[in-house]
Amino acid sequence: QNCSGPCRCPDEPAPRCPAGVSLVLDGCGCCRVCAKQLGELCTERDPCDPHKGLFCDFGSPANRKIGVCTAKDGAPCIFGGTVYRSGESFQSSCKYQCTCLDGAVGCMPLCSMDVRLPSPDCPFPRRVKLPGKCCEEWVCDEPKDQTVVGPALAAYRLEDTFGPDPTMIRANCLVQTTEWSACSKTCGMGISTRVTNDNASCRLEKQSRLCMVRPCEADLEENIKKGKKCIRTPKISKPIKFELSGCTSMKTYRAKFCGVCTDGRCCTPHRTTTLPVEFKCPDGEVMKKNMMFIKTCACHYNCPGDNDIFESLYYRKMYGDMA
């Protein structure tokens, strides 16, 4: 965005920002905007919250259009009411081993994080907490409505996925990579982040990728077949171009998205891959951004709950990234 032109702001008055979000001037010093928060997409016009020590990390110089709000090096993390130093590892509960890095927390599951799809011998799998055990285990509920179970089950298959092995050792480096976080948006373009030391210097670094679980404009419930309660991976009729802050992907993509359920289950990415996407901006500038592409989705009852500070974050995370 060129800041050399006259300042003109949106016709509506200054926005009302949510509690804890600063009202700041955009990067051109023109208009008052709600500051972007940690992990959100930022541009010169949409700056990060300076009162929280955030800056817009554009990555490589070639991508100086859109970045991700990042905490300055060494920024501490506040997690569950406790302050952790950058670089500090901690166990948030018996289920997760976490690391604070420059204001961002990345965690790895200590329990198996498989997603179990219905199968003929277990049509209604459910995770339950067993007394005296930390990790939840799968149990098979009896179907409440027998009519749901039938020939359609032949299409189901068991599909377990696990995160990367946290104990991979390479040349005096214990390689650790957290799972990709859930997409920051349930629909439309968002971001997903992870922490890894899988690099030449074995230093912890944050990685981010764009993600789109489903387009916002799609009315997916309409596509659910009669007698069904979910549409797991709806067919997208035509290839699409992705849009990012006014820039458009140079190629069209026949991307897969996750569907919806009408019975309280949520559909989330199950297997994903990360690929570079080139975006062309109105001024002709081209930038390359990594983006999540969905291979399969799973519809399950492990929807985010409010009872566990991390569980609610974690069950919306992506597993089995193949990048």
Partner: antibody, heavy 119, light 111 residues
Framework: EVQLVESGGGLVQPGGSLRLSCAAS????????MAWVRQAPGKGLEWVAN????????DLLASLKSRFTISRDNAKNSVYLQMNSLRAEDTAVYYC????????????WGAGTTVTVSS | VVMTQTPLSLSVSLGDQASISCKSS???????????LEWYLQKPGQSPQLLIY???SRASGVPDRFSGSGSGTDFTLKISRVEAEDLGVYYC?????????FGQGTKLEIK
């Protein structure tokens, strides 16, 4: 009632300095950009400068940048134009104007203050 | 950006229509894709007052006999039924590019 009142104009010799002030009332001052526009005797209007809500960004006519400075004090609901190294061609009525920063530019104008540069 | 107004003076009978043209030396579309073309009236001995902004939007309190139109580089201010209080100098103004510039003015006189 929304009002802008300019002051600080007068007769000054070439090379001299003047500081114009504009006192605003009747509206939330920090919600608006402010501007200065001048009009030489018998001539048309000429934009001089404007300033954002907090004074962190100022834009001036390129030919005046080295000599003129616009500033504001939100606590005093005032905007200022510091004019140095004045020349005869700076002789004009200087208007203070409110800039909405959104749809329109100058929706409220002061009555103006006269600056005469002459030896 | 140079703003050129025509005519420079205009003599109109009360109740008649008046039309003032303003041409810009280049397109005055701002980078946000809006066009900041405005019209001001300076009555004798008074400060200027805003009539029209963003090409065709009337400022509050401006009678509906004033209308603005145009796009790109050609713009027009029309007064459908001129009244005595309309006399003065009319200026067009562009706020899309630096430096912000006014036209040289059109003097409206009553016949």
């Amino acid at each position: 009632e929304v009002q802008l009142v300019e002051s600080g104009g007068g007769l000054v010799q070439p090379g001299g300095s003047l500081r114009l002030s504009c006192a605003a009332s009747g509206f939330t001052f920090s919600d608006y950009y402010m501007a200065w526009v001048r009009q030489a005797p018998g001539k048309g209007l000429e934009w001089v400068a404007n300033i954002n809500y907090y004074g962190s960004r100022t834009d001036l006519l390129a030919s005046l940048k080295s000599r003129f400075t616009i500033s504001r004090d939100n606590a005093k609901n005032s905007v200022y134009l510091q004019m140095n190294s004045l020349r005869a061609e700076d002789t004009a009525v200087y208007y203070c104007a409110r800039d909405t920063s959104r749809g329109s530019y100058f929706d409220v104008w002061g009555a103006g203050t006269t600056v005469t540069v002459s030896s | 950006v140079v703003m050129t107004q025509t005519p420079l003076s205009l003599s109109v009978s009360l109740g008649d229509q008046a039309s003032i043209s303003c041409k810009s030396s280049q397109s005055i579309v701002h980078y946000n894709e809006k066009t900041y073309l405005e019209w001001y009236l300076q009555k004798p001995g008074q400060s200027p007052q805003l009539l029209i902004y963003k090409v065709s939007s009337r400022a509050s309190g401006v009678p509906d006999r004033f209308s603005g139109s145009g796009s790109g580089t050609d713009f027009t201010l029309k007064i459908s039924r001129v009244e005595a209080e309309d006399l003065g100098v009319y200026y067009c103004f562009q706020g899309s590019h630096f430096p912000l510039t006014f036209g040289q003015g059109t003097k409206l006189e009553i016949k």
